[in-house]
Structures are given as C-alpha cells and as structure tokens.
Amino acid sequence: FERTRSLQDPCSNCPAGTFCDNNRNQICSPCPPNSFSSAGGQRTCDICRQCKGVFRTRKECSSTSNAECDCTPGFHCLGAGCSMCEQDCKQGQELTKKGCKDCCFGTFNDQKRGICRPWTNCSLDGKSVLVNGTKERDVVCGPSPADLSPGASSVTPPAPAREPGHSPQ
C-alpha cells in the first residue's frame, strides 16, 4: 500500500476504495469487507447498504460504490434511491392500514399502486356515459345527450373520399 507523501494533507492522496488509516501512520488502507469509499481522501469507509427482507439487491456493493436496492416482488419502491418498499395491490384496489381493499363504488384504480379515484363525471362536460365504470376502469364518456336525440346518429359519418392529387380541405 502506498505511503502518502503530500505535504498539506497526507490523506488527500488516498483514492476511492481506500481510507486514510490513522492507526497505521496515515497509510492508505483498502476499505474492509462490506464497506466503501466513493471519493478520495476519506478517513473512514462507509458501511454498505444491506438489501434484505422487503429489499433485494439491484447492484452489489463494491469498494468504491454503495449497494443499490429495489423491492422484492409483491412490493414497489418509494422515495429517493428506493428508500422504502410498499405493498402492491391488485387493480381495483387501494392500499390502506388494513392492507389492500377494493375501491368503493364510483371509484377506480387501474394500477397496482396509488389510490382509488372517482369516475369521470361525463355530465360536467355535457356528455353522456358511453361505457360504465368499474373498480378497475374509468367510465368512457360519449357524445352529449342532445346528440343522441331521436333521428340523430351516434355514429360519425365517414369523411368524403378524396380524389388523388387533391389536398385535404
């Protein structure tokens, strides 16, 4: 191992993956197992993050970089750097203190995470419900009720065929 020669701070020459060992006359010593230093000149190495239980290892710890975790299947990451794991639910459910619970009538969730959201109120946009909502899916809004009055067609007529060489109007 290299004995540092810097006149200012003998530790400044210690590279990432080592620490400046005061117990050994400020020699650069490699980080012990399960620890790392990501920058040079450090006087200690940091303990590697352990990915266990709800976490699983995405990237192993090395002498120069910390381990990275994601979540064990059945859970998903929350927070910066996957600092927490939260339970998945099925579509049509939301997570509560009591675990996964079905969405109440009039609400839906089309994902494995997040909360149940109210169905779209089609009438606010002057439209009618074309497809009813479910616990897993929002309603589909269609034409306004006036457009569906007797004699009115709910099907959009086809656009007139264009002759070759003519640009659309």
Epitope: F75, L78, E86
Partner: nanobody, 123 residues
Framework: QVQLVESGGGLVQPGGSLRLSCAAS?????NYWMNWVRQAPGKGLEW???????????YYVDSVEGRFTISRDNARNSLYLQMNSLRAEDTAVYYC????????????????SGQGTTVTVSS
C-alpha cells in the same frame, strides 16, 4: 446501526402454534409502526400484519385474521407474532419490517427489515 433480528421459526404440525419475535435496536422503537411480512416458497412478498406505535391499532391480512396476533413490548424493543391454528399455506420466511417516516399518513412503505425466520408447517 438500525437492526431487526427475527427468531422463533421452526417446523410445526398443521393446527400447531409458534411465536415469532423481532428484536429491534439502533432506533427509538416506540416511534414507529411495525409490520410482519412473509414470503412463501416461489411466491411474492405478502404483508401479514401491522401495529401502531403504541399498540392501539392492529391490522391483519384476511387469511390470518383470527389466527395470528401481533403485539409489541416497547420497553423491550420487541415485536411479536403469535401464530395459532397453523396451516400448510402459512409456510414461509417471516420478516419483521419497520414502517417508514409518515407510515399510515402519506404512505405504507417499510424502510428496514430483518433477515427473516423460516416457518414450516408440515405433518
């Protein structure tokens, strides 16, 4: 260093009982919701039960309701899971997990868990 260590697992016959323990250290145990989660062989992780900081609220997944009881002793920094009327489908590795800051308010994420203890229910 924050640490959770589970113990108490083992082999038990169907209908039998086990009591799991989780020893917490490195943080103020009484300030956190705590959880038990489990992973059956070849399956995803499943939440089992949780308990509020002071033990005043307890919740369970439907499949263990009435058979399992979660409890805590804040003076001893310990979490427990009393498992009665065990079934083959309870066979799993059981993990103790801490609810992260804001658990129960803005999220239900867990930020620390232990190595797990194995429960095998078989005749």
């Amino acid at each position: 260093q924050v640490q959770l260590v589970e113990s108490g697992g083992g082999l038990v016959q169907p209908g039998g009982s086990l009591r799991l323990s989780c020893a917490a250290s490195g943080f103020t145990f009484s300030n956190y919701w705590m959880n038990w989660v489990r992973q059956a062989p070849g399956k995803g992780l499943e939440w089992v039960a949780n308990i509020k900081e002071d033990g005043s609220e307890k919740y369970y997944v439907d499949s263990v309701e009435g058979r399992f009881t979660i409890s805590r002793d804040n003076a001893r920094n310990s979490l427990y899971l009393q498992m009665n009327s065990l079934r083959a489908e309870d066979t799993a590795v059981y993990y103790c997990a801490r609810g992260g800051e804001g658990y129960g308010d803005s999220h239900y994420g867990m930020d620390v868990s232990g190595q797990g203890t194995t429960v095998t229910v078989s005749s």
